[in-house]
Interface confidence: low
């Protein structure tokens, strides 16, 4: 029998390949690129989904200001190294043997170099700052009725715990929602911050990752809320080495 | 919206088995854990197991071991809680309850109406 | 397994009262502990999950709190619907177990 037969996708992943070859014929889902097994009850991994899009065809003052070791992942898109587990190697390379080292995020915390470049350890991002502007509107938002729509989305759509959104700023028309996560924090079975931060920057520009649900809707009271730009800062539980010439 | 619909009433004689359903809808079936809770008459609720939907483990409460089987059935989104070997104590309302996969989630957010089993003989 | 000892076991009040539930865990939960209410004839509704989190569309007049072993439910001003019976859980481990109950009535 087919796999469309039993109903055999990936909720949570549609960069997958599922056929029921798992044990006792179970739907058994593989990542595009990677072929790793995922569980579909969860969020894939930022890691497993940034190799599977790799692999596609080409085709204020309430506000929170980043520290100064805060990171925005300028370097874009590049087929990143997973371990078994999905997460991000902590030493990525290109086809040209430069080599940089990376946070769980997968964004780059170093200067590049070559292969004897060292990364001891991946070093976990454990606030992420989510910097939203809303296309205009013929007011601004409550903000408490706000907070409340973005908490539920993180929970419901994202299934990220409640106690991991720290915050949700608004000074029209930026809202800030704050994510954190520490190691000691997170249990097994916990949503990571940075994969439910990929999955709702991947909705916010109309590129959902879940099968067959339609784009994202959001709406606080009823009013669309459009988002017109997304920055994302990142914060690592170890500050980044970057050499003083790229700070300048 | 979400909905758990379970299946009507039963009467068993003592001995027998009983097979539960708990149809859910409105959420895609293997995102979500089911759980079976049982609640005598007159008397508090209690855990007889969940079954993770996405890989069809099931996890059974140690007072029923031996006796009770939960599975599902994904292309109908549908859980079954079979007890057997019954006796009269186990007359009680049965009910399948959504949860999540991890223990952080292992609270019930969508019920279904419950299943009154009465074992009389 | 975990025992959870709700008090008191039944309660009366007048509306508008402010009502406090408390739950102890025969071992550390964390946070995580699940308040219900069940009224006769009824399924259960979640009320709060992980200690403190209220459910979608529960009132705000319903709080949890408590972290370890130490747990309660309180409710800010009752309302005439509110009179049911309240179930503690702990969800931190299996076998997952619940309180006796507090059967909260009109005075």
């Known amino acids: 029998h087919t796999a469309a037969q039993d109903n055999c996708t990936c909720p949570t992943n549609k960069m997958t390949v599922c056929s029921p070859d798992g044990p006792g014929g179970r739907c058994q889902c593989r990542a595009l690129g990677s072929g790793m097994a995922v569980d579909c009850s969860t969020l894939t991994s930022k890691c497993l989904l940034l190799k599977a899009r790799m692999s596609a065809p080409k085709n204020a003052r309430t506000l929170v200001r980043p520290s100064e070791h805060a990171l925005v992942d300028n370097d874009g898109l590049y087929d990143p190294d997973c371990d078994p587990e999905g997460r991000f190697k902590a030493r990525q390379c290109n086809q040209t043997s430069v080599c940089w080292c990376v946070n769980s995020v997968g964004v780059r915390r170093t200067d590049k170099g070559d292969l004897s470049l060292r990364c001891d350890e991946l070093v976990r991002t454990h606030h992420i700052l989510i910097d939203l502007r809303h296309r205009p509107t013929a007011g601004a938002f409550n903000h408490s009725d706000l907070d409340a729509e973005l908490r539920r989305l993180f929970r419901e759509r994202y299934r990220l715990h409640p106690k991991f959104v720290a915050a949700v700023h608004y000074e029209q028309p930026t809202i800030q929602i704050e994510l954190r996560q520490n190691t000691s924090q997170k249990a097994a079975g916990d949503v990571d911050i940075g994969d439910a931060a990929y999955y709702f920057e991947r909705d916010i520009k109309g590129e959902s990752l879940f099968q067959g649900r339609g784009g994202l809707d959001l709406r606080v009271r009823g009013e669309p809320l459009q988002v017109e730009r997304t920055l994302i800062y990142y914060l690592d539980e170890i500050p980044p080495k970057f050499s003083m010439k790229r700070l300048t | 919206q979400v909905q758990l619909v379970q299946s009507g009433a039963e009467v068993k004689k003592p001995g027998a088995s009983v097979k539960v359903s708990c149809k859910a809808s409105?959420?895609?079936?293997?995102?979500?854990?089911m759980q079976w809770v049982r609640q005598a008459p007159g008397q508090g609720l209690e855990w007889m197991g969940w079954?993770?939907?996405?890989?069809?483990?099931?996890k059974y409460a140690e007072d029923f071991h031996g006796r009770v089987t939960i599975s599902a059935d994904t292309s109908t989104s549908t859980a079954y809680l079979q007890l057997s070997s019954l006796k009269s104590e186990d007359t009680a309302v049965y009910y399948c309850?959504?949860?999540?996969?991890?223990?952080?989630?292992?609270?019930?957010?969508?019920w279904g109406q419950g299943t009154l089993v009465t074992v009389s003989s | 397994d975990i025992q959870m000892t709700q008090s008191p076991s039944s309660l009366s009040a007048s509306v508008g009262d402010r009502v406090t539930i408390t739950c102890k865990a025969s071992?550390?939960?964390?946070?995580?502990v699940a308040w219900y209410q069940q009224k006769p004839g009824k399924a259960p509704k979640l009320l709060i999950y992980?200690?403190?989190y209220r459910y979608t569309g529960v009132p705000s007049r319903f709080s949890g709190s408590g972290s370890g072993t130490d747990f309660t439910l309180t409710i800010s001003s009752l309302q005439p619907e509110d009179f049911a019976v309240y179930y503690c859980?702990?969800?931190?481990?299996?076998?997952?177990?619940f309180g006796q109950g507090t059967k909260l009535e009109i005075k």
């Open positions: 309850a959504r949860s999540g996969f991890g223990s952080s989630y292992w609270y019930f957010d969508v």
């Open positions: 409105g959420y895609t079936f293997t995102t979500a854990g």
């Open positions: 079954i993770n939907t996405h890989s069809g483990v099931p």
């Open positions: 071992q550390d939960v964390s946070t995580a």
């Open positions: 992980s200690a403190s």
């Open positions: 859980q702990q969800h931190y481990i299996t076998p997952l177990t």
